[in-house]
């Protein structure tokens, strides 16, 4: 029997009597920014080097009694979760600790910044293998802390942080809200979001994935052989830091973008009960629980994609929302979603030399989200082909006309406020998979990509009667790159990708008559690249 | 107050500095902004991170910090530079009165200023 959390993150093929996956992260150094730690604890002795970095505020209260074991409690436990001999995730990883939290578990943004700077300087002075930085802390949204995390991430460091224990939108906290950081929420043994007193794990679009974070057994600072169970998003983040160390040890050349995509890809999908989250956050919160890959090698040939939601646009008439991919990722499609259904679609546009996904709110709308499908596609050459609104009644169409380019996504946006009202649906002619179609009042945008061995196909699922949700999934071996609704359905709230499934949402069916307008068709573009392994070798 | 002598020593150095001129107007068309934590109990007024524009060199950061000290001293305010950032972000950490924010925002190379705030173990 092994602790539930280690069992949960271990793929079945590793599960023996004891948790001993191959290569315990020995090529990786994990930096921990936390409280002081008890480095002579049996779990972490010889594995954790305590740096001389310390930047902490005074403890609150005049009668505060500094007790070493309490001062070390949080950091010691987390060091144990990451690399502990008996209860750690990455038993081979070496760690370095920086003290940025005082004996009450409190620190400052400035102290954390100076700590991150210390790590960057250490990296420059003595470059080692891959670095993982664990930030098991949270404060209010901080532009400067997020900016520092971005800089460190762009220097090749993997940052993992706690989503926060405030039962709130993680985007309101830092460093959880930094896009470059891997932000981790907490789940329990039942794969449910963790409740902590009256609060609990944070959630929302700024969370990348969840990991075990309740009743986690680890090193206790009460004695050098003591164990303790603790709960929180810090513990969840420590699991992901350990998994990241394992992955990087197996594949030291992985970029942050590749690592994040793999973490998402190998996670357990759709196991979290979303009813725990506020209704408006459910669609934005990833239903993913972290796990080690079943094999540390051989994932290179797969086409990895993830869904990135924008912040909410706000309700003003001309409001827009922008979703961006990471620097190493390709934007392969763009969709939009509005709870009120009032939106003016979306488009892919260039911004600072990169494509972004922009969604447009409509008059009377409560606001929109832009949803980007961000993929790892080495040697890709992607462009957007646009067709302005058509005069013909057949609607607007655009296709990928360049030799070797395949269609990866379709978007449409329109200036009129109520596109499609009293208009019959426009059907896409069969046998033309490289074509996007739309209303004659809409501009249609096709994302067209050329990459070695890339092939794509269109898959549709239509339901004649109105339904709140229509889905279509890509089969095994294919990856969803594009997700949209076939035009002609005026009550569509939008489309978005959830893992490998395209979801098209409609207004509550009770408000929609079952006319032909009620028909809803979800269109998925499914791609694969059987040459990604060779392509990545060629790049190296 | 702790380290008062140190503060005065810094102040004297700042007053002697050749940077004791009026602040140059920030680059045309850009206005530095001020940010603070939305959660009031977590705010730490009196300590500020002054973030400078991306390509600012360490020497310029130090010069900007000294200029702020000099101008603050001329207005009768004591300031203390707690740290000069370089390696990740150019800028500096300063202990000063909130009254000086307007002045600091007008310094050359300043991108934005953020009031320090608390972070917590999770």
């Amino acid at each position: 029997s092994i602790p539930w959390n280690l069992e949960r993150i271990t793929p079945p093929r590793y599960r023996a009597d004891e948790y001993q996956p191959p290569d315990g992260g020995s090529l990786v150094e994990v930096y921990l920014l936390d409280t002081s730690i008890q480095s002579d604890h049996r779990e972490i002795e010889g594995r954790v080097m305590v740096t001389d970095f310390e930047n902490v505020p005074e403890e609150d209260g005049t009668r505060f009694h500094r007790q070493a074991s309490k001062c070390d409690s949080h950091g010691t436990h987390l060091a144990g979760v990451v690399s502990g001999r008996d209860a750690g995730v990455a038993k081979g990883a070496s760690m370095r600790s920086l003290r940025v939290l005082n004996c009450q578990g409190k620190g400052t943004v400035s102290g954390t910044l100076i700590g991150l700077e210390f790590i960057r300087k250490s990296q420059l002075v003595q470059p080692v293998g891959p670095l993982v930085v664990l930030l098991p802390l949270a404060g209010g949204y901080s532009r400067v802390l997020n900016a520092a995390c971005q800089r460190l991430a762009r220097a090749g460091v993997v940052l993992v942080t706690a989503a926060g224990n405030f039962r709130d939108d993680a985007c309101l906290y830092s460093p959880a809200s930094a896009p470059e950081v891997i932000t981790v929420g907490a789940t329990n043994a039942q794969d449910q979001p963790v409740t902590l007193g009256t609060l609990g794990t944070n959630f929302g679009r700024c969370v990348d994935l969840f990991a075990p974070g309740e009743d986690i057994i680890g090193a206790s600072s009460d004695c050098s052989t003591c164990f303790v169970s603790q709960s929180g998003t810090s513990q969840a983040a420590a699991h992901v830091a350990g998994i990241a160390a394992m992955m990087l040890s197996a594949e030291p050349e992985l970029t942050l973008a590749e690592l994040r995509q793999r973490l998402i890809h190998f996670s357990a999908k759709d196991v979290i009960n979303e009813a725990w989250f506020p209704e408006d956050q459910r669609v934005l919160t990833p239903n993913l629980v972290a796990a080690l890959p079943p094999s540390t090698h051989g994932a290179g040939w797969q086409l990895f994609c993830r869904t990135v939601w924008s912040a909410h646009s706000g309700p003003t008439r001309m409001a827009t929302a922008v979703a961006r991919c990471a620097p190493d990722e390709e934007l392969l499609s763009c969709s939009s979603f509005s709870r009120s259904g009032k939106r003016r679609g979306e488009r892919m546009e260039a911004q600072g030399g990169k494509l972004v996904c922009r969604a447009h709110n409509a008059f009377g709308g409560e606001g929109v989200y832009a949803i980007a499908r961000c993929c790892l596609l080495p040697q890709a050459n992607c462009s957007v082909h646009t067709a302005p609104p058509a005069e013909a009644s057949m609607g607007t169409r655009v296709h990928c006309h360049q030799q070797g380019h395949v269609l990866t996504g379709c978007s449409s946006h329109w200036e009129v406020e109520d596109l499609g009202t009293h208009k019959p649906p426009v059907l896409r002619p069969r046998g033309q998979p490289n074509q996007c179609v739309g209303h004659r009042e809409a501009s249609i945008h096709a994302s067209c990509c050329h990459a070695p061995g890339l092939e794509c196909k269109v898959k549709e699922h239509g339901i004649p009667a109105p339904q709140e949700q229509v889905t279509v999934a890509c089969e095994e071996g294919w990856t969803l790159t594009g997700c949209s609704a076939l035009p002609g359905t005026s009550h569509v709230l939008g489309a978005y990708a959830v893992d490998n499934t395209c979801v098209v949402r409609s207004r509550d069916v009770s408000t929609t008559g079952s006319t032909s307008e009620g028909a809803v068709t979800a269109v998925a573009i499914c791609c694969r690249s059987r040459h990604l392994a060779q392509a990545s070798q060629e790049l190296q | 107050q702790e380290d008062e002598d140190g503060d005065y020593e810094e102040l004297v150095l700042a007053l002697r500095s050749e940077e004791d001129g009026l602040a140059e107007a920030p680059e045309h068309g850009t206005t530095a902004t001020f940010h603070r934590c939305a959660k009031d109990p977590w705010r730490l007024p009196g300590t500020y991170v002054v973030v400078l524009k991306e390509e600012t060199h360490l020497s310029q950061s130090e010069r900007t910090a000294r200029r702020l000290q000099a101008q603050a001293a001329r207005r009768g305010y004591l300031t203390k530079i707690l740290h000069v950032f370089h390696g990740l972000l150019p800028g500096f950490l300063v202990k000063m009165s909130g009254d000086l924010l307007e002045l600091a925002l007008k310094l050359p190379h300043v991108d934005y200023i953020e009031e320090d705030s608390s972070v917590f173990a999770q």
């Epitope: 029997s1 206790s220 709960s231 929180g232 | -």
Partner: antibody
Framework: QVQLVQSGAEVKKPGSSVKVSCKAS????????ISWVRQAPGQGLEWMGG????????NYAQKFQGRVTITADESTSTAYMELSSLRSEDTAVYYC????????????????????????WGQGTLVTVSS | DIQMTQSPSSLSASVGDRVTITCRAS??????LNWYQQKPGKAPKLLIY???TLQSGVPSRFSGSGSGTDFTLTISSLQPEDFAVYYC????????FGQGTKVEIK
């Protein structure tokens, strides 16, 4: 309150092995660690090793390394201690003892401390090694 | 291994006496020390844990103090049922016990 009930007295020949059992009742077995402590006639207490069923790992005192095996069976709430290559100086009363657990709050969380603090003991099993 | 040395190894006292037993660790063990009482033919009983915390159900005449290397068990007013052998035990490393202190009737 957890009760620990041990198996009966044993007489063994030198060079043989003995396996003593310790059954827990009245508590959640898997949330408690079990240690084994022995006491030779007229002597003090000596810790041999312990198992923490949550971690699924056993820890042994250097002196007994390689000679003692501690296991636990969660389905029957029973811990076992097997000592091999017995010699006359292994004649002693062998006790199983449960590690204590307390629950406190830190950072707004519940924390369970598992440590070598022996709050409940078995009645002891006398093992006599004699030719 | 951490060595624990108890003193005295035995003492004679009368009912109502204040009794002090000391325990010294060969290296610093924080507050990771427990005290036990053992009566003939019985299993030990936990009295004090973590250096100074009284185990529930144990009379308040028993108290513990100390941290680091030097620890003390005090019985403020010896009762007839207190005549027994007392052991200290550290748990900072693998557990080790002191050799015991026998408290006998004078």
């Amino acid at each position: 309150q957890v009760q620990l009930v041990q198996s009966g007295a044993e007489v063994k020949k030198p060079g043989s092995s003995v396996k003593v059992s310790c059954k827990a009742s009245g508590g959640t077995f898997n949330s408690h660690a079990i240690s084994w402590v022995r006491q030779a006639p007229g002597q003090g207490l000596e810790w041999m090793g312990g198992i923490n069923p949550i971690l699924g790992i056993a820890n042994y005192a250097q002196k007994f390394q390689g000679r003692v095996t501690i296991t636990a069976d969660e389905s029957t709430s029973t811990a076992y201690m097997e000592l091999s290559s017995l010699r006359s100086e292994d004649t002693a009363v062998y006790y199983c003892a449960r590690h204590y657990e307390i629950q406190i709050g830190r950072y707004g969380m519940n924390v369970y401390y598992l440590m070598y603090r022996f709050a409940s003991w078995g009645q002891g099993t006398l093992v006599t090694v004699s030719s | 291994d951490i060595q624990m040395t108890q003193s005295p190894s035995s003492l004679s006292a009368s009912v109502g006496d204040r009794v002090t037993i000391t325990c010294r660790a060969s290296q610093g063990i924080r507050s990771a020390l427990n005290w036990y009482q053992q009566k003939p033919g019985k299993a030990p009983k936990l009295l004090i844990y973590q250096g100074s915390t009284l185990q529930s159900g144990v009379p308040s005449r028993f108290s513990g103090s100390g941290s680091g290397t030097d620890f003390t068990l005090t019985i403020s007013s010896l009762q007839p049922e207190d005549f027994a052998v007392y052991y200290c035990q550290q748990f900072d490393g693998d557990p080790t016990f002191g050799q015991g202190t026998k408290v006998e009737i004078k």
